[in-house]
């Protein structure tokens, strides 16, 4: 039994880090493998993660962690019984994938403006709380070509757009994701999408 693709890990910079790897053949990850992880400092405990299958030869492990601080560094040991398959380390602050924003809501009652709001996925004391920027994806359910991305580079989790920038009488969906430039993070997963019917008063035209 050998590791084909070494574990790669990402942290939500709060409480979970997720490690994925591939074995050289079909593996029952939960019965055959264990991933041990330990914070590097005196008297720290070793924790054991039981991996789950992620495709035939793929395994995934969710590592529970206390509040992450930038200095945290973990040793990782992948075991198959008594055999050490791989040894590595992981610094959560250097491999961050933010949590997905939540509670995306489209407010359609503000004259002819669409107001999209969502919630910052971190508590106020978390370092990422004040460092997230967002991308909002809006698309038409009727027209696959009607697909747009708005970059929200300010901290407020909201976006205003004129309803007239979208087609009237059509259903649209929106979703949002986050990233933090300060930690050079990857993008979060997309939030669950929300749907609304876009309608606005066409401006009166004089001939």
């Amino acid at each position: 039994m050998k590791v084909l693709q070494e574990p790669t890990c990402v942290s939500d910079y709060m409480s979970i880090s997720t490690c994925e790897w591939k074995m050289n053949g079909p593996t029952n990850c939960s019965t055959e493998l264990r991933l041990l992880y330990q914070l590097v400092f005196l008297l720290s405990e070793a924790h054991t993660c039981i991996p789950e299958n992620n495709g035939g030869a793929g395994c995934v492990c969710h590592l529970l962690m206390d509040d992450v601080v930038s200095a945290d560094n973990y040793t990782l040991d992948l075991w198959a019984g008594q055999q050490l398959l791989w040894k590595g380390s992981f610094k959560p602050s250097e491999h961050v994938k933010p949590r997905a924003p939540g509670n995306l809501t489209v407010h359609t009652n503000v004259s002819d403006t669409l107001l999209l709001t969502w919630s910052n996925p971190y508590p106020r004391d978390n370092y990422l709380y004040n460092h997230l920027t967002y991308a909002v994806n809006i698309w038409s359910e009727n027209d696959p070509a009607d697909f747009r991305i708005y970059n929200v580079t300010y901290l407020e989790p909201s976006l205003r757009i004129a309803a007239s920038t979208l087609k009237s009488g059509i259903s649209y969906r929106a979703r949002v994701r986050a990233w933090a430039q300060c930690y050079n993070t990857t993008w979060s997963e997309w939030s669950p999408s929300t749907k609304w019917h876009n309608s606005y008063r066409e401006p009166f035209e004089q001939h």
Epitope: S15, I16, L39, F41, L42, L43, S44, E45, E52, H62, L64, M65, D66, D67, V68, V69, R99, A100, G102, N103, P123, R124, D125, S191, P192
Partner: antibody, heavy 115, light 107 residues
Framework: QVQLVESGGGLVQPGGSLRLSCVAS????????MNWVRQAPGKGLEWVSY????????YYADSVKGRFTISRDNAKNSLYLQMNSLRDEDTAVYYC????????WGQGTLVTVSS | DIQMTQSPSAMSASVGDRVTITCRAS??????LAWFQQKPGKVPTRLIY???SLQSGVPSRFSGSGSGTEFTLTISSLQPEDFATYYC?????????FGQGTKVEIK
């Protein structure tokens, strides 16, 4: 091995105060965020409060906000819960529990609020 | 605040039965859900975290699934020591909230 020992419970009248303590051993307390969780007699679990190891930030359940204060003394390996303006509905066994996500619990201390 | 609704609140089952307990969150909590077991007079112990990850040392007959708002704890073959009360917990945001509990009793 990890051990958490709560103390300070007892009988107190409505409107009174009590200070609970939780002494930790078997791990580096200063590196761990901590919680208080309570359980009223015959009822379910209710999270009460949290204090972060990283920032010292604190959070409270709405039911205790403004009345309870969580604190810690890393030099004494101790977690505290100062409970003021106690009410009948605060009667419960109070547990301290370690992060991440309550991986270790103390045995609890009983707080009875009654006249 | 996020509400966690567990069902059923109580159930009777026999040794060897497959038992399923569900937990519904009032809003999306991704996979920030844990399951705890509590026996009478004892402190709770964590069985599952991150919705589906089995806690080390917990028998493999326990499993968790779900994401978002709907979650399930399954005991594939109920053993005598499994008669207890089970709680779900969301830690996606503060305040953290438990479900009201499911008591699994002997039929």
């Amino acid at each position: 091995q990890v051990q958490l020992v709560e103390s300070g419970g007892g009988l107190v009248q409505p409107g009174g105060s009590l200070r609970l303590s939780c002494v930790a051993s078997g791990f580096t307390f200063s590196h761990s965020s901590m919680n208080w969780v309570r359980q009223a007699p015959g009822k379910g679990l209710e999270w009460v409060s949290y204090i972060s190891r990283a920032t010292g930030a604190v959070y409270y359940a709405d039911s205790v906000k403004g009345r309870f204060t969580i604190s810690r003394d890393n030099a004494k390996n101790s977690l505290y819960l100062q409970m003021n303006s106690l009410r009948d509905e605060d009667t419960a066994v109070y547990y301290c529990a370690r992060e991440p996500v309550f991986d270790y619990w103390g045995q609890g201390t009983l707080v009875t609020v009654s006249s | 605040d996020i509400q966690m609704t567990q069902s059923p609140s109580a159930m009777s089952a026999s040794v060897g039965d497959r038992v399923t307990i569900t937990c519904r969150a009032s809003q999306d909590i991704s996979n920030y859900l844990a399951w705890f077991q509590q026996k009478p007079g004892k402190v709770p112990t964590r069985l599952i975290y991150a919705a589906s990850s089995l806690q080390s040392g917990v028998p493999s007959r326990f499993s968790g699934s779900g994401s978002g708002t709907e979650f399930t704890l399954t005991i594939s073959s109920l053993q005598p020591e499994d008669f207890a009360t089970y709680y779900c917990l969301q830690w996606s945001s503060y305040p953290r909230t438990f479900g009201q509990g499911t008591k699994v009793e002997i039929k």
